[in-house]
């Protein structure tokens, strides 16, 4: 099966790598612009230079291109706890991340929120916190895991999944209650 190519890809594939086909004259291949620049004017003829201009402040191109405009720099989302790891330059977009001892939770492909890594209080660290994953905790006896926190079995209701982990404690509580009633 031949993969479907868009018009731009079809046009580019006629020219050697690093060049693109002139939009008004398909017999001319123009040199693409370097990263950090954009296409101001197509090359006037074969072997002649493409007019590329440097991206203005607040914009970038990260690879060779024949874009008519540079791309706008991303802004880190403060409302999601994001911080700027590195500023935008003409050839690289802003890099956003989280603070130390935080991890990224992706709500969607291009939206993440920063959260504090769990400390595993009343438990031990099974897997350390990673850039995109919270700490994985193992709870001490008498505690169960709820939303990645070790919670006392005294907070375990019979209807919840924790009953298996807290079975001895629940039976003891039941026994105590029974012995107190005559």
């Amino acid at each position: 099966l031949v993969p479907h190519l868009g018009d731009r890809e079809k046009r580019d594939s006629v020219c050697p790598q690093g060049k693109y086909i002139h939009p008004q004259n398909n017999s001319i291949c123009c040199t693409k612009c370097h990263k950090g620049t954009y296409l101001y004017n197509d090359c006037p003829g074969p072997g002649q230079d493409t007019d590329c201009r440097e991206c203005e402040s607040g914009s970038f191109t990260a690879s060779e291109n024949h874009l008519r405009h540079c791309l706008s720099c991303s802004k880190c989302r403060k409302e999601m706890g994001q911080v700027e790891i590195s500023s935008c330059t003409v050839d690289r977009d802003t890099v956003c991340g989280c603070r130390k001892n935080q991890y990224r939770h992706y709500w969607s492909e291009n939206l993440f929120q920063c959260f504090n890594c769990s400390l595993c209080l009343n438990g031990t660290v099974h897997l350390s916190c990673q850039e995109k994953q919270n700490t994985v905790c193992t709870c001490h006896a008498g505690f169960f895991l709820r939303e990645n926190e070790c919670v006392s079995c005294s907070n375990c209701k019979k209807s919840l999944e924790c009953t298996k982990l807290c079975l001895p404690q629940i039976e003891n509580v039941k026994g105590t209650e029974d012995s107190g009633t005559t």
């Epitope: 989302r77 403060k78 409302e79 999601m80 939770h105 929120q113 959260f115 990645n148």
Partner: nanobody
Framework: EVQLLESGGGLVQPGGSLRLSCAAS????????MAWVRQAPGKGLEWVSH????????YYADSVKGRFTISRDNSKNTLYLQMNSLRAEDTAVYYC????????????WGQGTLVTVSS
């Protein structure tokens, strides 16, 4: 008691508009991010849009960018979603939600309002 009550859903033709509202009570509405999340039939949850406490920062999923507008009125404890140029693929139950700042869950959810885009 915390309540998030969505309204404004319904049946609309492709290209039409709807305005969803979410009336909040039982918590300090003006603190923190509020979001609209949707679930299309047989699909998972999709984060549609969010807005920060003062409305100064907004986010839109690529699928709705340029068509949907999120806003809030903290004096009325209400969140809005203006939906224009609606498409069949926007058909879903739309939920108003308050994301937690402590863990990747929602502190509060509404019951949802159904938006059906069909001719």
């Amino acid at each position: 008691e915390v309540q998030l009550l969505e309204s404004g859903g319904g049946l609309v033709q492709p290209g039409g508009s709807l305005r969803l509202s979410c009336a909040a009570s039982g918590f300090t509405f003006g603190n923190g991010v509020m979001a609209w999340v949707r679930q299309a039939p047989g699909k998972g949850l999709e984060w549609v849009s969010h807005i920060n406490e003062n409305g100064g920062a907004t986010y839109y999923a690529d699928s709705v960018k340029g068509r949907f507008t999120i806003s809030r009125d903290n004096s009325k404890n209400t969140l809005y979603l203006q939906m224009n140029s609606l498409r069949a693929e926007d058909t879903a139950v739309y939920y108003c939600a308050k994301p937690s700042i402590e863990s990747p869950i929602f502190d509060y959810w509404g019951q949802g309002t159904l938006v059906t885009v069909s001719s």
